[in-house]
Each structure stands twice: as C-alpha cells, then as structure tokens.
C-alpha cells in the first residue's frame, strides 16, 4: 500500500508536471510569432484511456516530436530551451509511472494538436492529483 | 507589478563561493519561469542559470557544474548556489522573472547585484 510519504511525492512530481505542461501550453497561446500556425498543423497522438499513472507511456512516448515542434520557435531567446522543459518532463514521467511493468499505449484514432494534446495532459495530472488529496 | 529583491552579491577571492537570493512579490502566477542574467561591463547581458515552477533548468555552458539553481515555489525565491567562482564570474547579476519559456517584453528585472571574483 503507497505510504503518506510516497503519495506526497506523487503529488509533488504530478504538480510539476502539470506546471511545465501549462507553461508549454502559455508560450504557444501567448506566441506572437506566425510560426504558432504551423505549429497548430503538427499532429499528436492521443491515448485511447488516460486514467492512471502508467498511461503516462503514452505522453512519453510524444515528448520526442513535442520537443521538434518546440523547436519552431527557434528565433525567440529561450530563458529554458525546449530540450530543457522536454528532459525535465521525462524524467518525472520515468519516475510516476514506474518501469517495472511494460505498458503498451493504445492511441485513440483522431489525432490532435499541439494545443489540443497538452490540454489533454493537463487535465490528467489535474484528475490523479485531485484523488491524491 | 511584479517586484523583485535580490541579495548575497559581494567579493570573493577566485575558488570562493557565494549564494545569491530573489524573491519576487506582486502580481505572480504559479506558472512562471525565474533565473539570472549577468552583465559584465562592456559586454552584453548573458543567461547564467534558469529555472521554472516546474523544476526545468537551463544553465550557461560556462557555469555548469560550478553553479545550482534552485527555487522555493511556496515563497517566490530563488536563489543561485556559485562555487569555484572566476576573475570572469565578475559582474552584475540580475533576478529575472517570466511567465513563458522565451524572452519576452512582460518579463520583470530585478535592481541587479554585484559580484567581484578578485585576490
């Protein structure tokens, strides 16, 4: 049984996540670039179920062409760089969902933007925190 | 308004360390992005060390592995840990604050403190 403690960094490593994906998802809002619309023409695949810990296979499995996409906004002056973000990300990823098992991630059919993707990922870290506290 | 207050700047003689402090109050949003900039005289200013909410860094090629960057989420600090400090290390350092990943006009400043690495 997770112990208060183990579940406290759950919590944690889930929060940063989160905020790291809701920064992400700001600076492609806010970008006053028209390189935002081509951003919106890459494609992401989504999970066909996203309710625990070990569906974040299937997040990790995107963070590769999430970074390339990133990378679009080459001309801006990067306080963090989107390897920076990306790598942050994974290895909190690693971490939450554990590599004792292997999970196989089912995608869903329709495929999704940039927005549309971290939007859905946001609202999974939101889900798993608010049954933690 | 954001406001920032940066402090522990100082001299130190070449192999010393320091550890410098921000804390920002204001209007702040959880989502941000806090770090360093330096700027010594004649040059331009240069990213030393970033950090977001999220635990994201990013550190000049020059200080890695000398210098940690780390933050208080709960009290709006960071705080910039400088070992094995260099003649080159001195100059003005700056406490930055954004709410995105990339430079941009709404991003805050801090007064700047100043550091002097010299025997």
């Known amino acids: 049984a997770p112990t208060s403690s183990s579940t406290k960094k759950t919590q944690l490593q889930l929060e940063h996540l989160l905020l790291d994906l809701q920064m992400i998802l700001n600076g492609i809002n806010n970008y006053k670039n028209p390189k935002l619309t081509r951003m919106l023409t890459f494609k992401f695949y989504m999970p066909k179920k996203a309710t625990e810990l070990k569906h974040l296979q299937c997040l990790e499995e995107e963070l590769k062409p999430l970074e390339e996409v990133l990378n679009l906004a080459q001309s801006k002056n990067f306080h963090l760089r989107p390897r920076d973000l990306i790598s942050n990300i994974n290895v909190i990823v690693l971490e939450l969902k554990g590599s004792e098992t292997t999970f196989m991630c089912e995608y869903a059919d329709e495929t999704a933007t940039i927005v549309e993707f971290l939007n859905r990922w946001i609202t999974f870290c939101q889900s798993i925190i608010s049954t933690l506290t | 308004e954001v406001q920032l207050v940066e402090s522990g700047g100082g001299l130190v003689q070449p192999g010393g360390s320091l550890r410098l402090s921000c804390a920002a109050s204001g209007s702040i949003f959880s989502i941000n992005v806090m770090g360093w900039y330096r700027q010594a005289p004649g040059k331009q200013r240069e990213l030393v060390a970033a950090i977001s909410s999220g635990g994201s860094t990013n550190y000049a090629d020059s200080v890695k592995g000398r210098f940690t960057i780390s933050r208080d989420n709960a009290k709006n600090t960071v705080y910039l840990q400088m070992n094995s400090l260099k003649p080159e290390d001195t100059a003005v350092y700056y406490c930055?604050?954004?709410?995105?990943?990339?430079?941009?006009?709404?991003?805050?400043w801090g007064q700047g403190t100043q550091v002097t690495v010299s025997s």
């Open positions: 930055m604050y954004a709410s995105s990943f990339y430079e941009d006009e709404t991003d805050y």
